[in-house]
């Protein structure tokens, strides 16, 4: 399974480094159902 690396902000996913937006400062909607930002 892919490991979510919350401390570094990155995850190893299929041998590729992908930015992991569960990071505290994320504003990408990583949390299911959490309203982020305004209506855009």
């Amino acid at each position: 399974d892919a490991e979510f690396r919350h401390d570094s902000g990155y995850e190893v996913h299929h041998q590729k480094l992908v930015f992991f937006a569960e990071d505290v400062g994320s504003n990408k909607g990583a949390i299911i159902g959490l309203m982020v930002g305004g209506v855009v």
Partner: antibody, heavy 112, light 111 residues
């Protein structure tokens, strides 16, 4: 009114594929992740994966890795979930979620 | 996979009385960054689910303050201080320390 509108119910035969759409209405879908979940009849919630419409990056639950494809069309503010090699256990309501908005759900029935 | 286990699976409640639901994870959800990656969702009858609590203790927007959540790294409790009729539905705990997994759900209904 801001909402996510999903495509209608589907009935498929085992082995077939299904493609469910999720269109943002009054909502720019390319700004936030789009998550996909499903709920089998009388069962709990199961996360399928998510897509970042800004760059197309996807993450899938390993269980679905080989059968699911998440895509998006930012020009039409629509995200898609395609599930292949359908089996009876895939009968479920499929939901898309982006930011605080949930789609109404799409019932996919797999039956011979 | 991190397994989320809820209890009870069914909870008859009386309006105006308190209620609580337990959730246990097979692995600690408390990360060294101080965040506990535990969430609570409610699915009301005939509706899509909605987020109630995120990162263990934060109330989502629009959620009444009669809802609260607490816990350790593996044991969590959702409390409703005074149940209202509109609180009926199925409550799910979930984690996203490693991908997302959900508990099996607790059905809350009026006695």
């Amino acid at each position: 009114q801001v909402q996510l509108v999903q495509s209608g119910a589907e009935v498929k035969k085992p082995g077939a594929s299904v493609k469910v759409s999720c269109k943002g209405s009054g909502f720019n879908i390319k700004v936030y992740y789009v998550h996909w979940l499903r709920q089998a009849p009388g069962k709990g919630l199961e996360w399928i994966g998510r897509i970042d419409p800004e760059n197309g990056e996807t993450i899938y639950t390993p269980k679905f890795q080989d059968r699911v494809t998440l895509t998006e069309d930012t020009s039409s503010d629509t995200a898609y979930m395609e599930l292949s090699s359908l089996r009876s256990e895939d009968t479920a309501v499929y939901y898309c979620v982006s930011s605080g908005y949930w789609g109404q759900g799409t019932l996919v029935t797999v039956s011979s | 996979d991190i397994v989320m286990t809820q209890s009870p699976l069914s909870l008859p409640v009386t309006p105006g009385e308190p209620a609580s639901i337990s959730c246990r994870s097979s692995k600690s959800l408390l990360h060294r960054n101080g965040i506990t990656y535990l969430y609570w969702y409610l699915q009301k009858p005939g509706q899509s689910p909605q987020l109630l609590i995120y990162q263990m203790s934060n109330l989502a927007s629009g959620v009444p303050d009669r809802f609260s959540s607490s816990g350790s790294g593996t044991d969590f409790t959702l409390k409703i201080s005074r149940v209202e009729a509109e609180d009926v539905g199925v409550y799910y705990c979930a984690q996203n320390l490693e991908l997302w997994t959900f508990g099996q759900g607790t059905k809350v209904e009026i006695k």
